[in-house]
């Protein structure tokens, strides 16, 4: 949050409210890391090893996708035709589907810097730090290039383009037993 | 500064119900998730579920499911532990603590803890 | 669910001496481990977490290490204000758990 500015990786003892707190690092500090990859398995590099997402609880974050994540795609996509733009992205499984997904929503592209200060990117990242285990430990070590290039949103007709992709992907993610097209 | 403030103490009879809450002030209440850990007399914590505000859901320990409702009013900041069919090992300090979503992923911040002692 | 074995239960040491604290996972869980220190009628502390990452404002005798299974809290040389049970949880997966403490006590 706003409130949280220290340096890399250090907390802050303070007392107060009757129990602890301490600061830790905050998410403007703590980008997630950013690699121009395609996969088509459901690992995702981070640093010198891949991010298994085979072990995630896929039904409560389908759960969290339907409740919430995909309005707020939906309204980042707002004034958009649905026909606009092609899906040619796709994803065989759900560890797959997660894996392009949080590739898509967190690296950077050409023409699209970043999404991952929009809402659904946050939401989307906090599904999988609380719903996949050891995925919030990836993003501990994450490096820190975003801090500097995301201080503004700018929504150009790419990252309209990439948010179509996440839809597909995402709805994809919600039907599993469909045979891939 | 942070804070995570609780309801006072509590002394409730078997069977009945126990709401406790913890006022967050200090921080972006979307940002973290709230869980609940309690600790019983002369016992180690034990991890009861949370409440992620940023996505409106809660998860919660099975040996709690059922027995236990973690919830949140986004716009007071605060969250709710409510525990229900009330038995005397229940009685047990209940702390609030906060955690990152979206960064940190650590209980950072604690409630000063509530005392609920279940006794006829 | 994983069961996160702390040992010993209990440490009697003088201050100056170095504390080793144990604390195992029944599964593997990376580094996905923190420790906390709880005195008498307070809350836990957060001391390290991600196994070894450290705290400004926590003094730096105190350290983290291990990964995987096997997991280490080290004190360097303790203090009277040291003396406490000590707590490792575990964030990998739900439900979080935690060890069942260790408790360093005046030799």
């Known amino acids: 949050g706003l409130n949280d500015i220290f340096e890399a990786q250090k907390i802050e003892w303070h007392e107060g409210g009757g129990g602890s707190e301490q600061k830790l690092i905050s998410e403007e500090d703590l980008g997630s890391s950013h690699h121009h990859h395609h996969h088509s398995s459901g690992l995702v590099p981070r640093g010198s090893h891949m991010y298994d997402f085979t072990n995630c609880d896929f039904e409560k974050i389908k759960a969290a996708y339907l409740s919430t994540i995909s309005k707020d795609l939906i309204t980042y996509m707002s004034g958009t035709k649905s026909t606009e733009f092609n899906n040619t992205v796709s994803c065989s499984n759900r560890p797959h589907c997660l894996t392009e997904i949080q590739s898509l929503t967190f690296n950077p592209t050409a023409g699209c810097a970043s999404l991952a200060k929009e809402m659904f990117a946050m939401k989307t990242k906090a599904a999988l730090a609380i719903w996949c285990p050891g995925y919030s430990e990836t993003q501990i070590n994450a490096t820190q290039a975003m801090k500097k290039a995301r201080k503004s949103k700018v929504t150009t007709n790419k990252c309209l383009e990439q948010v179509s992709q996440l839809q597909g992907l995402w709805r994809r993610f919600n039907r599993p037993l469909l045979k891939q097209q | 500064q942070v804070q995570l403030v609780q309801s006072g103490p509590e002394v409730k009879k078997p069977g009945s119900s126990v709401k406790v809450s913890c006022k967050a002030s200090?921080?972006?209440?979307?940002?973290?998730?709230m869980h609940w850990v309690r600790q019983r007399p002369g016992q180690d914590l034990e991890w009861m579920g949370t409440?992620?505000?940023?996505?409106?859901?809660?998860d919660y320990n099975q040996n709690f499911k059922g027995r236990a409702t973690i919830t949140a009013d986004k716009s007071t900041s605060t969250a709710y532990m409510e525990l229900s069919s009330l038995r005397s090992e229940d009685t047990a300090v209940y702390y609030c603590?906060?955690?990152?979503?979206?960064?940190?992923?650590?209980?950072?911040?604690w409630g000063q803890g509530t005392l609920v002692t279940v006794s006829s | 669910e994983i069961v996160l074995t702390q040992s010993p239960g209990t440490l009697s040491l003088s201050p100056g001496e170095r504390a080793t604290l144990s604390c195992r996972a029944s599964?593997?869980?990376?580094?996905?481990v923190h420790w906390y220190q709880q005195k008498p009628g307070e809350a836990p502390r957060l001391l390290i977490y991600?196994?070894?990452q450290s705290i400004s404002g926590i003094p730096d005798r105190f350290s983290g290490s291990g990964s995987g299974t096997d997991f280490t809290l080290t004190i360097s040389r303790l203090e009277s204000e040291d003396f406490a049970v000590y707590y490792c949880?575990?964030?990998?997966?739900?439900?979080?758990?935690f060890g069942r403490g260790t408790k360093v006590e005046i030799k």
């Open positions: 603590a906060r955690m990152g979503v979206t960064h940190s992923y650590v209980m950072d911040a």
């Open positions: 200090g921080y972006i209440f979307t940002d973290y998730a």
């Open positions: 409440f992620i505000p940023l996505l409106d859901t809660s």
């Open positions: 599964q593997h869980i990376s580094r996905s």
């Open positions: 991600f196994a070894s």
């Open positions: 949880q575990q964030s990998y997966s739900f439900p979080y758990t």
